[in-house]
Interface confidence: low
């Protein structure tokens, strides 16, 4: 006859490990007892359990409550045992020794592998700002046994670098994702993907990118200077910019205080019916935590009395 077992039995941490040992004998052969022991290199054998055909299962004190026979129905030639709630320390070599009648003793070895699924963590890098060079966007760390694989899934262009740190029974893998920040990356997902034989499916952690920037400011409203004449109502200047975080706006007048009646409403400066005292240099200040920008324009309110020739030209031009 011969013993049937596995070279390697693989379980996930906390699962029950079935250690197979089946004697395939000739008809009439009987199994008297099966002894299970742990036999790691460099250490003496440590008995797990003894299965006796007559007296049943005896479990050694070190494994009390953790070793059982598989549930019935059981084949009398089956010496397999269940090791309950496998932990990392159970990883190693095991041997089953089968005493048969009349063929004698047989032994076989298997290796128990305990997979420790990783619990990945994602750490965002420093605040991303447009204009920086290659910058750490995020790092992702996963520790498990065996070493997990850590990769990135994103539409964003970048570079990755990984390092591994071996512990006594596991390995930690850290992967860093570096990129050159640009405003187009705002809101883009950066996903860390962790693969491991102990996971039914890849674990994914997503980080949304935020890149601070502030666009150049410009002022709208003066496209047609001839509309800025005394008495005109509803004249307004609008400051245009965009940024992340969203910017705030502030209006000042370079050559003095803002005239009375001029309304500041965020990015818009609203004028009452125009008078010559509204002529001047207006400055829009745009700022966020990242930067600030200024844009200035000159308002020249026309007096039709003083410039009747010009008005005639405008009329004829129309």
């Amino acid at each position: 006859g011969e013993l049937e077992t596995s070279d390697v039995v693989t379980v996930v941490l906390g699962q029950d490990a079935k250690l197979p040992c089946f004697y395939r004998g000739d008809s009439g052969e009987q199994v008297g007892q099966v002894a299970w022991a742990r036999v790691d290199a460099g250490e003496g054998a440590q008995e797990l359990a003894l299965l006796h055909s007559k007296y049943g299962l005896h479990v050694s004190p070190a494994y009390e409550g953790r070793v059982e026979q598989p549930p019935p129905p059981r084949n009398p030639l089956d010496g397999s045992v269940l090791l309950r709630n496998a932990v990392q320390a159970d990883e190693g070599e095991y041997e089953c020794r089968v005493s048969t009648f009349p063929a004698g003793s047989f032994q076989a070895r298997l290796r128990l592998r305990v997979l420790v699924p990783p619990l990945p963590s994602l750490n965002p890098g420093p605040a991303l700002e447009e204009g920086q060079g290659l910058t750490l966007a995020a790092s992702c760390t996963a520790e498990g046994s065996p070493a997990p694989s850590v990769t990135w899934d994103t539409e964003v262009k970048g570079t990755t670098s990984s390092r591994s740190f071996k512990h006594s029974r596991s390995a930690a893998v850290t992967s860093e994702f570096h990129l050159v920040p640009s405003r187009s990356m705002n809101g883009q997902p950066l996903t860390c993907v962790v693969s491991h034989p102990g996971l039914l499916q890849d674990q994914r952690i997503t980080h949304i990118l935020h890149v601070s920037f502030l666009a150049e400011a410009s002022v709208r409203g003066l496209e047609d200077q001839n509309l800025w004449h005394i008495g005109r109502e509803g004249a307004m200047l609008k400051c245009l910019s965009e940024g992340q975080p969203p910017p705030s706006y502030n209006w000042t007048r370079l050559d003095g205080p803002l005239p009375s009646g001029v309304r500041v409403d965020g990015d818009t400066l609203g004028f009452p019916p125009l008078t010559t005292e509204h002529s001047g240099i207006y400055v829009c200040h745009v700022s966020n935590e990242f930067s600030s920008r200024d844009s200035q324009v000159t308002v020249d309110v026309l007096d039709p009395q003083e410039d009747s020739g010009k008005q005639v030209d405008l009329v004829s031009a129309s």
Epitope: N123, G125, S139, T141, S168, T174, E176
Partner: antibody, heavy 117, light 107 residues
Framework: QVQLVQSGSELKKPGASVKVSCKAS????????IHWVRQAPGQGLEWIGW????????KYNERFKGRVTITADKSTNTAYMELSSLRSEDTAVYYC??????????WGQGTSVTVSS | DIQMTQSPSTLSASVGDRVTITCRAS??????VAWYQQKPGKAPKLLMY???NRFTGVPDRFSGSGYGTDFTLTISSLQAEDLAIYFC?????????FGQGTKLEIK
Amino acid sequence: QVQLVQSGSELKKPGASVKVSCKASGYTFTSYYIHWVRQAPGQGLEWIGWIYPGNVNTKYNERFKGRVTITADKSTNTAYMELSSLRSEDTAVYYCARSNPYVMDYWGQGTSVTVSS
Amino acid sequence: DIQMTQSPSTLSASVGDRVTITCRASQSVNNDVAWYQQKPGKAPKLLMYYASNRFTGVPDRFSGSGYGTDFTLTISSLQAEDLAIYFCQQAYRSPYTFGQGTKLEIK
């Protein structure tokens, strides 16, 4: 590459305090521990304590409890070690070192602290 | 506190020699032991971690072994640049303690 750059030498009087800084670069500051270790002239290495900048947890060697405070500023990637009530036997080179979690893989260049009246 | 006792305290050897430094812990520290090399006037550098793992960039002439209380750092073929003080450290339980150091001299 990983770098830890420490502040310059200090000369202090007994009873005073000293605060040594350690600026980290080349890695994610909040993902590793920073340890402080000292070495008296011609002597061995003595562990003072650690901080984990990710959640600012600290652990101190009982020998220094009450006299040492380790802090970290995430905005500047800088760790600090402050030792108070200085005495002459605190004269040493003070090192910061990064670890993950207790093996110190990269060290600062060291800061010499001399306590003398 | 866990005491780490290194021996010898000084060691003189010739280039090409095989050199062994030992470190004994006052209680079991599993394999949570690191070895550091410190050259004169410089900060320590990590050589080995978890007793037998060589750190990045460390030449393979350095090796480590041990578990429990007894640990060994071996240099298979001594080079002139290995002149330094070597420290062991237990990372098993706080406070993390170091051996007193072994000064390695070149004959």
